[in-house]
């Protein structure tokens, strides 16, 4: 419906001139929700194009989007979050293309933050923790997180771990000794609400200890 893939990843859309994608973020600023749309064709001339949403709104029939560089944006408390809204691309009063979208099915969570990794010498493991603003939210509380890590020298060899909590333990023996690792995390709605992966958190970098030859164990840094 939105030009995104079912698995939460973006897909190459079959592009017509005005095909577009949108995502919602609920309670993104206190009790305010946001809706962000953009064209799928990077070459489309957006000069006179506007977006409008109608239906499934509280107290009003329609709302106009604000244009912010090349995205179209609404921040409001007026989303009903029940039923489908009609989102249209317009030039003047003329609608060029429209899509009916349930805003609860295009939710993009906020990116996780405060990612850190602590080495536990006695346990020979690494405890990965991160935070998410969604723990405090009323609506989108339940998320699936995707923790991805790689040895820094391995450009595209990411290992992914899915989890519902904000804490993960990585066993030292599963990692290379004396190596620099990059780790990052993203989130996707996992209960009632549907949608897309958040942006990745900022990456965190950590080094694994050397192997201690006498014991065969790694030395902490």
């Amino acid at each position: 419906e939105s030009g995104y893939a079912q698995n939460g990843d973006l897909e190459d859309a079959e592009l017509d001139d005005y095909s577009f994608s949108c995502y919602s973020q609920l309670e993104v600023n206190g009790s305010q929700h946001s809706l962000t749309c953009a064209f799928e064709d990077p070459d489309v001339n957006i000069t006179n194009l506007e977006f409008e949403i109608c239906g499934a709104l509280v107290e009003v029939k329609c709302l106009n989007f604000r244009k912010l560089q090349e995205i179209y944006f609404i921040e409001t408390k007026k989303f009903l979050l029940i039923g489908k809204s009609n989102i249209c691309v317009k030039v003047g009063e003329k609608s060029l293309t429209c899509k009916k979208i349930d805003l609860t099915t295009i939710v993009k969570p906020e990116a996780p933050f405060d990612l850190s990794v602590v080495y536990r010498e006695g346990a020979n493991d690494f405890v990965v923790t991160f935070n998410t603003s969604h723990l405090q939210k009323k609506y989108v509380k339940v998320l699936m997180h995707d923790v991805a890590y790689r040895q820094e020298k391995d450009e595209n060899k990411w290992t992914h771990v899915n989890l519902s909590s904000t804490k993960l333990t990585l066993l030292q023996r599963k990692l290379q000794p004396a190596a620099m690792y990059e780790i990052k995390v993203r989130s996707i709605p996992d209960h009632y609400f549907k949608g897309f992966w958040s942006e990745w958190s900022p990456s965190y970098y950590f080094r694994t200890p050397e192997i201690n030859n006498s014991s065969g164990e790694m030395d902490p840094i």
Partner: nanobody, 115 residues
Framework: QVQLVESGGGLVQPGGSLRLSCAAS????????MSWYRQAPGKERELVAS????????NYADSVKGRFTISRDNAKNTVYLQMNSLKPEDSAVYYC????????WGQGTQVTVSS
Amino acid sequence: QVQLVESGGGLVQPGGSLRLSCAASGFTFSNYAMSWYRQAPGKERELVASISVFGGGTNYADSVKGRFTISRDNAKNTVYLQMNSLKPEDSAVYYCNKRRYDDYWGQGTQVTVSS
């Protein structure tokens, strides 16, 4: 102010691969469609590939279709160009910029395809 820093170019044999990176700063990267351009000596700068704001839409010049792939990482404010099956005619200085660019350009990165 806007800064665009391209990297990843080099000398490669025909049929080889390179991955170009462009680190952007000084503007809200995630609000713009981005593109790669190239300029060979004595020629006009040409559009190679473009990617939409969310990354789901991509367009390519006919000469690179099926060989080049543009992608973006909004968390890192970076746009990439994976170039496979390189040909001598791909030799040029490669630049990234907004699809609807301002006057500012980075220094570019030189790609030379030669045996």
